[in-house]
């Protein structure tokens, strides 16, 4: 089966959710860790990450189809200090598989708004910080 990782973002009011989604088979969950790094081009690891999620095998899920696991990192208010380059990664302690997602960026602008660029699913998201709208 194919294991892959995708990055996405969503906004709820002033909150920005950064989401790392790993697609894998049910039996591959054990020993998998998903993590999010900022401004780490070479040394992104669970130890240097902003947040990590250790996956557990869920006996309640039937079948052998592909399932997804999500790590969500929520920023309550994006500030200039959040500007930078982010990357979703995952690795399996059992199989040694290492996944690296595309780099994406948060850019806080002079107007007090911010943009999220480089996401594969939606190429460019622009958020108005004050209005809380997505354009």
């Amino acid at each position: 089966g194919c294991i892959n990782i995708t990055s996405s973002a969503s906004q709820e009011g002033t909150r920005l959710n950064l989401i790392c989604t790993v697609w894998h088979k049910k039996e591959e969950a054990e020993g998998f860790v998903v993590f999010l790094c900022k401004d780490r081009s070479g040394d992104c690891s669970p130890e240097t990450s902003l947040k990590q999620l250790r996956l557990k095998r869920d006996p309640g899920i039937d079948g052998v189809g592909e399932i997804s696991s999500q790590l969500m990192f929520t920023i309550s208010q994006v500030t200039p200090l959040h500007s930078g380059t982010y990357q979703c990664c995952a690795r399996s302690q059992k199989s040694g598989i290492r996944l690296q997602g595309h780099f994406f960026s948060i850019l806080f602008t002079e107007t007090g708004n911010y943009t999220v660029t480089g996401l594969k699913q939606r190429q460019h998201l622009e958020f108005s910080h004050n209005e809380g709208t997505l354009s």
């Epitope: 009011g13 401004d39 240097t48 902003l50 309550s76 208010q77 500007s83 930078g84 007090g112």
Partner: antibody, heavy 119, light 107 residues
Framework: EVKLVESGGGLVQPGRSLKLSCAAS????????MAWVRQAPTKGLEWVAS????????YYRDSVKGRFTISRDNAKNTQYLHIDSLRSEDTATYYC????????????WGQGAMVTVSS | EIVLTQSPTTMTASPGEKVTITCRAS?????MHWYQQKPGASPKPWIY???KLASGVPDRFSGSGSGTSYSLTINNMEAEDAATYYC??????????FGAGTKLELK
């Protein structure tokens, strides 16, 4: 256990300069933005400056721009505040603080370094 | 710059009493944070994002509010709650601003 230890405070004459240091331990220093917050004797808290996790971007309150310089050395797990042309109104306890990444709260604070500007 | 005005400036309360401290912002803000500071000590985050209690904060404390009006409430005042409380917010471009503080004393 997160620990922030400030040093470099003391009695300084007006017009002189001073460098405060904050040694951090107990967390991945290079992941977190850092700040300096000051408190004049018997007064309230006042944010002074912040630096992003990598050290490239710095932010200051308007009243200190040009005289204060915040910086950090991630290899040494230390942040700094350099104050030029000290004035009596700079007399305060200077606290080193960490920025919470997911919120806009300052979540860990050092014990503070007292700076007294007097001739 | 958004100005935060705390009231009252000083207050006294008896053990078991309900205490409310308010923080008014000169313009609407998204969240308010509160810190507790005791004499000779560093400030401690007490309530963040308006209503979330920081680790180790007793559940007799609560926070609420929206827009320009926020408050910190102590349901049953205890001796250890005597301290100065500061509100704080973030907005752009003035960044981080604090209220002047409310000194809470035990009667």
């Amino acid at each position: 256990e997160v620990k922030l230890v400030e040093s470099g405070g003391g009695l300084v004459q007006p017009g002189r300069s001073l460098k405060l240091s904050c040694a951090a331990s107990g967390f991945i220093f290079s992941n977190y933005a850092m700040a300096w917050v000051r408190q004049a004797p018997t007064k309230g808290l006042e944010w002074v400056a912040s630096v992003n996790s990598g050290g490239a971007n710095t932010y200051y309150r308007d009243s200190v721009k040009g005289r204060f310089t915040i910086s950090r050395d991630n290899a040494k797990n230390t942040q700094y505040l350099h104050i030029d042309s000290l004035r009596s109104e700079d007399t305060a306890t200077y606290y080193c603080a960490t920025h919470n990444y997911e919120s806009t709260v300052f979540d860990y604070w050092g014990q503070g370094a007292m700076v007294t500007v007097s001739s | 710059e958004i100005v935060l005005t705390q009231s009252p400036t000083t207050m006294t309360a008896s053990p078991g009493e309900k205490v409310t401290i308010t923080c008014r912002a000169s313009s609407s803000v998204s969240y308010m944070h509160w810190y507790q500071q005791k004499p000779g000590a560093s400030p401690k985050p007490w309530i963040y994002e308006t209503s979330k209690l920081a680790s180790g904060v007793p559940d007799r404390f609560s926070g609420s509010g929206s827009g320009t009006s926020y408050s910190l409430t102590i349901n049953n005042m205890e001796a250890e709650d005597a301290a100065t409380y500061y509100c704080q917010q973030w907005n752009y471009p003035s960044m981080y601003t604090f209220g002047a503080g409310t000194k809470l004393e035990l009667k």
